[in-house]
């Protein structure tokens, strides 16, 4: 798998989206889970609906929501209040049994806010009731890897 | 501020039919998944509908298979719900509500349905 | 279904009183799927407490949500008068279903 780039600015909010074939995966519920290290497990940080009809409701982990097109075969991930910490590689699964097949290999960069040399105070963050696509979503920059780059810093 | 507004309830005989409508503002709607939930008159909340912000995917309660059909016009930022083979059981205010955190996080007033001859 | 038993059915209190609401599920669901809404006569529902234990926006934190599993509860601490109503609990880890409400009332 290739690993497409993402870039968010810290402070908004970031949305990945991951294609996949509708028919290949119909019937399968998807998650969305982080690289820890280059060889690491992928530890999940939240997965679609239980009932696999209901994909299409949002499913929330703290600032992260996931959302499934089952139809037209595009799996979405939105990175609310995006952080720092947020920054690294992830991964687009669709589950079966046990076993998950990786959809798309993610690498998340955030970028420092423009703004903030501006007092913390100055800055404004939208409640629950409000919706994060109307306050803080920027159009996701996204760019594959190219062949030699590498998404993790070398250990020594 | 998201704002919700139900409109088209009323009286109907057992056996007709009624369409509600679900105005709605203050967010971008084809984004988000709707629902409709009902309240039969002194009693609790029940579950109707879902539907998806782009209206592909629908999904019922048991109770109403068959009988009612979500919908959506995300052009007209709209909500419906066609009602048919109306039953006294059906009698409710019928509310929708929109996805947040949870599934019906923002609702609306509600419009009122009676179903008696 | 999941089924949610909603007790007590009516609790009677005072202004100032703690108050606290049980609901009980017919087979586990996960917290992060579990909402708690206040009714008022011919009023539309309130989310309060979604993800078993998150206050809403605007809510006071008079109101907690906790537990797990089959049993949940929520807790007002000490109750205002704006605070008498009816409470649902909600699970959407499934289909959706919703407890049968308690009705906080005056003492």
């Known amino acids: 798998h290739n690993t497409t780039v993402f870039q968010g600015v810290a402070g908004q909010s970031l949305q990945v989206s991951c294609p996949y074939d509708s028919m290949k995966h119909w019937g399968r519920r998807k998650a969305w889970c982080r690289q820890l290290g280059e060889k690491g497990p992928c530890q999940r940080v939240v997965s679609t609906h239980n009932l696999w009809l209901l994909s299409f409701l949002r499913r929330w982990n703290g600032s992260t929501a996931i959302t499934d097109d089952t139809l037209g075969g595009t799996l979405t991930i939105t990175l609310r209040n995006l952080q720092p910490h947020d920054a690294g590689l992830y991964q687009c699964q669709s589950l079966h049994g046990s076993e998950a097949d990786t959809l798309r290999k993610v690498l998340v960069e955030v970028l420092a806010d423009p703004l903030d040399h501006r007092d913390a105070g100055d800055l404004w963050f939208p409640g629950e009731s409000e919706s994060f696509e109307d306050a803080h979503v920027e159009h996701s920059i996204s760019r594959s890897l190219l062949e030699g780059e590498i998404p993790f810093p070398p250990t020594s | 501020e998201v704002q919700l507004l139900e409109s088209g309830g009323g009286l109907v005989q057992p056996g007709g039919s009624l369409r509600l409508s679900c105005a709605a503002s203050?967010?971008?709607?084809?984004?988000?998944?709707m629902s409709w939930v009902r309240q039969a008159p002194g009693k609790g909340l029940e579950w109707v509908s879902v539907?998806?912000?782009?209206?592909?995917?629908?999904y019922y309660a048991d109770s109403v298979k068959g009988r009612f059909t979500i919908s959506r016009d995300n052009s007209k930022n709209t909500l419906y719900l066609q009602m048919n083979s109306l039953r006294a059981e059906d009698t409710a205010v019928y509310y929708c509500?929109?996805?947040?955190?949870?599934?019906?996080?923002?609702w609306g007033q509600g419009t009122l349905v009676t179903v008696s001859s | 279904e999941i089924v949610l038993t909603q007790s007590p059915g009516t609790l009677s209190l005072s202004p100032g009183e703690r108050a606290t609401l049980s609901c009980r599920a017919s087979?586990?669901?996960?917290?992060?799927?579990l909402a708690w809404y206040q009714q008022k006569p011919g009023q539309a529902p309130r989310l309060l407490i979604y993800?078993?234990?998150s206050r809403a926006t605007g809510i006071p934190d008079r109101f907690s949500g906790s537990g797990s599993g089959t049993d949940f509860t929520l807790t007002i601490s000490r109750l205002e008068p704006e605070d008498f109503a009816v409470y649902y609990c909600?699970?959407?880890?499934?289909?959706?279903?919703f407890g049968g409400g308690t009705k906080v009332e005056i003492k």
């Open positions: 509500a929109k996805e947040g955190r949870t599934i019906t996080m923002d």
């Open positions: 203050g967010f971008t709607f084809s984004s988000y998944a």
């Open positions: 539907i998806s912000g782009s209206g592909g995917s629908t």
């Open positions: 087979q586990s669901v996960s917290s992060s799927y």
């Open positions: 993800g078993a234990s």
């Open positions: 909600q699970q959407d880890d499934r289909s959706p279903t």
